[in-house]
Each structure stands twice: as C-alpha cells, then as structure tokens.
C-alpha cells in the first residue's frame, strides 16, 4: 500500500518554466488539485478509551501519530469511522458510543443501546458509524474515543474497525 | 465556518483573455472543476416531520431555504444524512424512520425497530443514517422527513443530526 | 439516468494538437481527472447469498456483470453498500451480516443482532451499511454477500438496498 506523502504545495509548482513549460499534460498532472486520504484499521490491542490504529494502512498526505490522524494540507475533509462491537450482554442494557474528536474536542458522536431486553445472552453484534464534513487546518488532529473499548473485538474483526479521511476540497 | 457561495459558473470564466490570459496557475484555479457542498445541523426546535436545519452551517454552492437544500449547480451528488434518536420506550416497539426526499419525492429511506422487547426502559439510543448518489438539476430540493421527530434529541445531541451533500462530478 | 462509459483513457487525449490545441477550456474538460462511479439498487428477486443488482442504475466507467461491479480504471475507490432488512422474528436472536468482497475475498463485514429478546414479534426493521476505501486494479470485482438474503425486503423497500462505488483518486 502506498504511504507516500505530498512534499510540495501547489504554490511551489513551476507552472511556467522548467521542463514542463509547454507540455499541458505535464502541467495538468502537476495542477493544484491536491488529494489527501487515510484508511486505518484499529490496533490489535486496545487498552484505553482513545483508540489506536495500525499505521501501516493507507496514508497519503496525512500523518499518523499517537492515535491521531494529523492533517498536512488545509481544506474540507470527509471523515468517517466505523466500529464493529461484540457485546457479551450483562443483565442490563449497554450504551455503545463512538466519538469523533477534532483537536481533542468532541465534534460528533453516535450512540446505540444494545442488550435492551436485560437478558443475559451469548453475544450481541452491533455496528456503529459516524461521519463528519469539516474544514481542517494544518496540524489538526482527528481521533476516536469509545467508552467501551473492551467490546471492540479485534480478534474476530480485525478489518472491520476503521477510521478514514479524505480531502474533498482544498482551501486555495 | 465559511458560508460563501460560488457566484460564477465556469462558463463565465474568461479562460483566454483578461488578466488571466497567460498565467496557467490562474487559469487552472478558475478551471471547470466546480465543487459544491453543504453540512447542516438540525434546528434546535423541531415541530413537524419535515426537519429544519441551522442555516449557519457550511454552505458552498448550495442554498438553504425552508428546510430544503437547493442545488445551484447540476451534477452527480453524494447526499448523506445521519440522525441520533433517544427513545423513552413505551410498552411496545417503535419504528424509527429517516426519509431522504428529492423534490418532495421519497428517494430513499432507512428504518430501524427499537424497544423491541416491549419493556418500558429509561431510554434507548439509536443512530440512523442514509446516503444517496444521484444526478441533481439546478433548483432541485433535498430534504429529510421523519415520522418521530420527537425522538430526535436536539438538546443532548445538537451536533449529531446532520444533512450533508457534495458534488462528486459536474455535468459538463 | 446516464449509463455512459468512458471510452478513452487520458493518454489518448490530444492535449497538444487537434481542434483542442489552443482552447484551454476544451483542454481542461478533457484533462486527466477521470471519474468513475456506480449506484445500483438490489435486484427484485433474490435467491442466493451473493446479491444481484439492477444493471439499469447509474454506471459510469464501471461495468456490471453477474452480481459484480467490475472496475475499468485503476485507482483509490470509495465503496459503500447499504441494506434494509425486515425480519419476522423467530423465537431466537438473528445475526444479520453484510460482507463486502473484493475478488471473492472478504474485505470488510458488518454484523448486527436483532430479535435479541427472543420474543416472536410481528417484524423488526434493521438498516446495515458498510464502506471501504481501497486501491482497485482494472478488472477487480466488487460484490456483496449476506447470510440472510430472505430478510432483504425488496418489495417494501426496492430503493433502499444499494451498492455504490466512486473513484476518489486515479493512479496516474
């Protein structure tokens, strides 16, 4: 999987002059239509409410550091997180929560109640997702928090728990 | 948050001539790769099944009017709505519904049953989302309808109930 | 709805020369910013776990064949599937599953348990979605598998069950 980053901002592109001076295909390929994206799967071992991610996923124009996606290019981003829960029901209902944080502030959350019958069953599956469309500046951090990280079953579902962002429109 | 709109259609862009005549960066920045988007949160006080939205959200190339997003530029749009419900369970099950309407016609809906055990519980959380990919013409309206607007908890979850659209591909 | 395909790859575009030689608007419109997308609704009659789709939906730069979307242009794709289930509850819980397959390998799955109270109720609605961001090569197949296709209610909800892909970034 490619993990290359985008070293130059479009302002550095010599659109007139250089080897590219009269070749429009070359010019267009270096035009200011930046793309940045990430798609990371949850880390195998979770031990806190702030989720950690496998940094060997897809990263392009976005950095990963200490559980955070760190934005490299300003613009309007589409952010989406999806989590697969597996709950061993106790004898009461359980509220599952997924929080999307921007710079450590809760920007959006999703909640679902499971085990509502109050019966102790073998297991209950629940899938929870949350999206966000937001302007993000350089060095903005994106992270995910859950109350009940113990219900994210990374052995059964190592591929199902993902955090993804992609730049929709840069801010030029 | 920016709420700027797009005043000119690309046909008005003087791609040859004008101040921009020989500056390719200038030309490219004004090229026909339009982007339009919206991200609105639900209004604080809901009193009907057609949802109202806070017009001070993100609006770019899309207008908001009377509960509708009004399309300004034709093309293929990705539309997504997400609602957070909080239900005080009666002694019967409750069907939560989210309808996406295009020009007042139901284009897509999502349904989930909660309180299925028939037990009166304190509360049950449920998150519901719906997306759509569709060609929309100028002045097309996008709106959202729910049966049970009283279960959309705008005081606890003012940020969780959103309607968003973005132009994927214009129709040039 | 348009079902046109993209006949030329950008390498065939005469960016210098031809009628387009000095008209930048013309050049830009034919520039190498390919877009490919699909939005298909589930077929009316389902009889196996691999879902079939109505090929008269939106198809642009993507082919449909035997339940598969077949990729025509390499790149990073956003893939999303949403299914609406209607379950006549038996006297045990039911696990609903949605699998996204790339080339017949499970790439991502979502599971939700319904009817968890073990009570035989009239019906329970459940909506399930799954997304994916992945690099796909030419001729890659995208398909959807469910355990319980009999619970996908195509008569009540013919429009609610969709598979959609769109190219986010081509691999040039």
């Amino acid at each position: 999987q490619r993990t290359d980053s985008i070293p130059n901002s479009p302002d550095n592109i010599p659109l007139r002059g250089g080897n590219c001076s009269e070749d429009l295909l070359c010019i267009l390929k270096r035009a200011p239509f930046k793309k940045s994206w990430a798609y990371l799967q949850v880390a195998k071992h979770l031990n806190k409410t702030k989720l950690s991610w496998n940094k060997d996923g897809i990263l392009h124009g976005v950095r990963y550091q200490d559980g955070n996606l760190v934005i490299q290019f300003p613009g309007l981003y589409f952010i989406i997180c999806q989590l697969q829960f597996l709950v061993q029901c106790p004898n009461n209902s359980v509220d599952l929560k997924l929080e999307l944080l921007i710079n450590k502030h809760i920007k959006k959350q999703a909640l679902v109640t499971v085990c509502e019958s109050g019966m102790q069953t073998k297991h209950v599956y629940q899938n929870l997702s949350q999206f966000l469309l937001d302007y993000l500046q350089v060095n903005t951090t994106v992270s995910v928090n859950v109350d009940t990280f113990q219900y994210i079953d990374t052995s059964t579902f190592p591929l199902e728990n993902v955090l993804s962002v992609f730049l929709y429109s840069n801010s030029d | 948050q920016r709420t700027d709109s797009i005043p000119n259609s690309p046909d008005n862009i003087p791609l040859r001539g004008g101040n921009c005549s020989e500056d390719l960066l200038c030309i490219l920045k004004r090229a026909p790769f339009k982007k339009s988007w919206a991200y609105l949160q639900v209004a604080k006080h809901l009193n009907k099944t057609k949802l109202s939205w806070n017009k001070d959200g993100i609006l770019h190339g899309v207008r908001y009017q009377d509960g509708n997003l009004v399309i300004q530029f034709p093309g293929l749009y990705f539309i997504i709505c997400q609602l957070q419900f909080l239900v005080q369970c009666p002694n019967n099950s409750v069907d939560l519904k989210l309808e996406l309407l295009i020009n007042k016609h139901i284009k897509k809906q999502a349904l989930v049953t909660v309180c299925e055990s028939g037990m009166q519980t304190k509360h049950v959380y449920q998150n519901l989302s719906q997306f759509l990919l569709d060609y929309l013409q100028v002045n097309t309206t996008v709106s959202v309808n729910v049966d049970t607007f009283q279960y959309i908890d705008t005081s606890t979850f003012p940020l969780e109930n959103v309607l968003s659209v973005f132009l994927y591909s214009n129709s040039d | 709805q348009r079902t046109d395909s993209i006949p030329n790859s950008p390498d065939n575009i005469p960016l210098r020369g031809g009628n387009c030689s000095e008209d930048l608007l013309c050049i830009l419109k034919r520039a190498p910013f390919k877009k490919s997308w699909a939005y298909l609704q589930v077929a009316k009659h389902l009889n196996k776990t691999k879902l079939s789709w109505n090929k008269d939906g939106i198809l642009h730069g993507v082919r449909y064949q035997d339940g598969n979307l077949v990729i025509q242009f390499p790149g990073l794709y956003f893939i999303i599937c949403q299914l609406q289930f209607l379950v006549q509850c038996p006297n045990n819980s039911v696990d609903l599953k949605l699998e996204l397959l790339i080339n017949k390998h499970i790439k991502k799955q979502a599971l939700v348990t319904v009817c968890e109270s073990g009570m035989q109720t009239k019906h329970v609605y459940q909506n399930l979605s799954q997304f994916l961001l992945d690099y796909l090569q030419v001729n890659t197949t995208v398909s959807v598998n469910v355990d319980t296709f009999q619970y996908i209610d195509t008569s009540t909800f013919p429009l609610e069950n969709v598979l959609s892909v769109f190219l986010y970034s081509n691999s040039d």
């Epitope: 999987q1 052995s155 | - | 196996k48 355990d147």
Partner: antibody, heavy 124, light 111 residues
C-alpha cells in the same frame, strides 16, 4: 511448531454431555482461531465449530443447540461440550488450527494443524 | 448445511493425472475463493494440501494443484504415486461463517 492434543473420556452414556479438551503447545492460543471436527467411523468429516481468542464462536447450524466451545488462554487450552449425546455422535473428534490471516483482506488458509484425534463412543 | 458433493472414488495408474471434483452452492464454493483440500491416510488425521482454491502450503508437492469454476472446485494430482492413495476431502467457507466438507473421495492407485 504448533502441536495439538485432544483429551477426554472415550465412552459417554446416551443423553449425557461430552467434554473434550484440546491442549495447544508450541504456540500461543491467543494468536489463532481454533476448530473442532468429527468423523464417524468409515464416514466423512463434519465441522463442529470454532472459537476466537476473544471467546466469540461460530457453530455448525445442525449442532448449534447442543454445542459450546470455550477457551482458557491461561492454560493454552480450548474445550468442546456436546450435550444430549446419542449413538449418532460416536466418532473420532479432532481439534485443529483454523488459520485465518487478516492483512488487507481476510485470507483463510484452512485447517492447517490437526490433533491426532480421540475416539468417543456413545453407549450405555 | 449440506455437504459438498464429491465422487465416492477415483483411480489412476502411477504417472497418470487424476482430477477430483467438488460441487457446492452459490453460498459457499461459488461465492468465496476459500476452498481447501485435505488428504487423509487410514487411521491418520487429515493433512491440508491446498488452501484458497489453488495455493499449496510449504512442504506439499507441486504435483497437487487446485482450481475452481463457478460452484465447482477441482483437485488435480499429476504424476500419480503410490503414496497418494488416500481419502481426499474438499472444504469451503460458507456464508454462515462456517466450514462445510465434502463427503470424501477414495483415491486408488492401480498396479
């Protein structure tokens, strides 16, 4: 190199519950998925069920109401319980490693390491 | 879940090639590329010979190969040898997240 060893009673009375244990040596039980399979004399193989390190299980639908598979990571063991035994449950019972890798995709490598099997007879 | 369908027996002479078929449904063999083949000698545990339709584990002879078309998978053994005489079972992952086996095929090496 991972090795598996089944243990448990060779004889079970009708209507009783069979309890078998599989001990894993040469590797951590937490790193893989584990299955039980059985084979009546002169007949084919029948998959019974699997357990993940988390304790999550999948069972053969035809046996689901009678089967419980559990794991004890501290002892590097997993167990099978099969209730309401009848003569039709007489078979050789095998435990096996159910090798799945999750990288970019799920890759199912099949049942790649097996125990030698233990014979269970149901008789009064 | 119904067992996959295999021929009860096949035979061949040393040096020949034989093919064993395994027919499933659109809920198992047809939908996933997760077909395995096992070899079992009398009184022994099964041994994995092919996984994911056509892949061989290390240590398995390249005389063994697998393929699949539609709902049917096949195991081909070329250059048949006397030690290949055994029972062969196919297996497939199913939509219910389970494994299903074939009924087994007895391979006899003639001569």
């Amino acid at each position: 190199q991972v090795q598996l060893q089944e243990s448990g009673p060779g004889l079970v009375k009708p209507s009783e519950t069979l309890s078998l244990t599989c001990t894993v040596s040469g590797g951590s039980i937490s790193s893989y998925i584990w299955s039980w399979i059985r084979q009546p004399a002169g007949k084919g193989l029948e998959w019974i069920g699997r357990i993940y390190a988390s304790g999550n299980t999948n069972y053969n639908p035809s046996l689901k109401s009678r089967v419980t598979i559990s794991v004890d990571t501290s002892k590097n063991q997993f167990s099978l319980k099969l209730s309401s035994m009848t003569a039709a449950d007489t078979a050789v019972y095998y435990c096996a490693r159910d090798y799945r890798v999750a990288g970019t995709y799920y890759y199912y490598y099949g049942l790649d390491v097996w125990g030698q099997g233990t014979t269970v007879t149901v008789s009064s | 879940q119904s067992a996959l369908t295999q021929p009860a027996s096949v035979s061949g002479s040393p040096g020949q090639s034989i093919t064993i078929s395994c027919t499933g449904t659109s809920s198992d063999v047809g939908v996933y590329d997760y077909v395995s083949w096992y070899q079992q000698h009398p009184g022994k545990a099964p041994k994995l010979m092919i996984y994911e339709v056509s892949n061989r584990p290390s240590g398995v002879s390249n005389r063994f190969s697998g393929s699949k078309s539609g709902n049917t998978a096949s195991l081909t053994i070329s250059g048949l040898q006397t030690e290949d005489e055994a029972d062969y079972y196919c297996s497939s992952y199913t939509s219910r997240s389970t494994w299903v086996f074939g009924g087994g095929t007895k391979l006899t090496v003639l001569g």
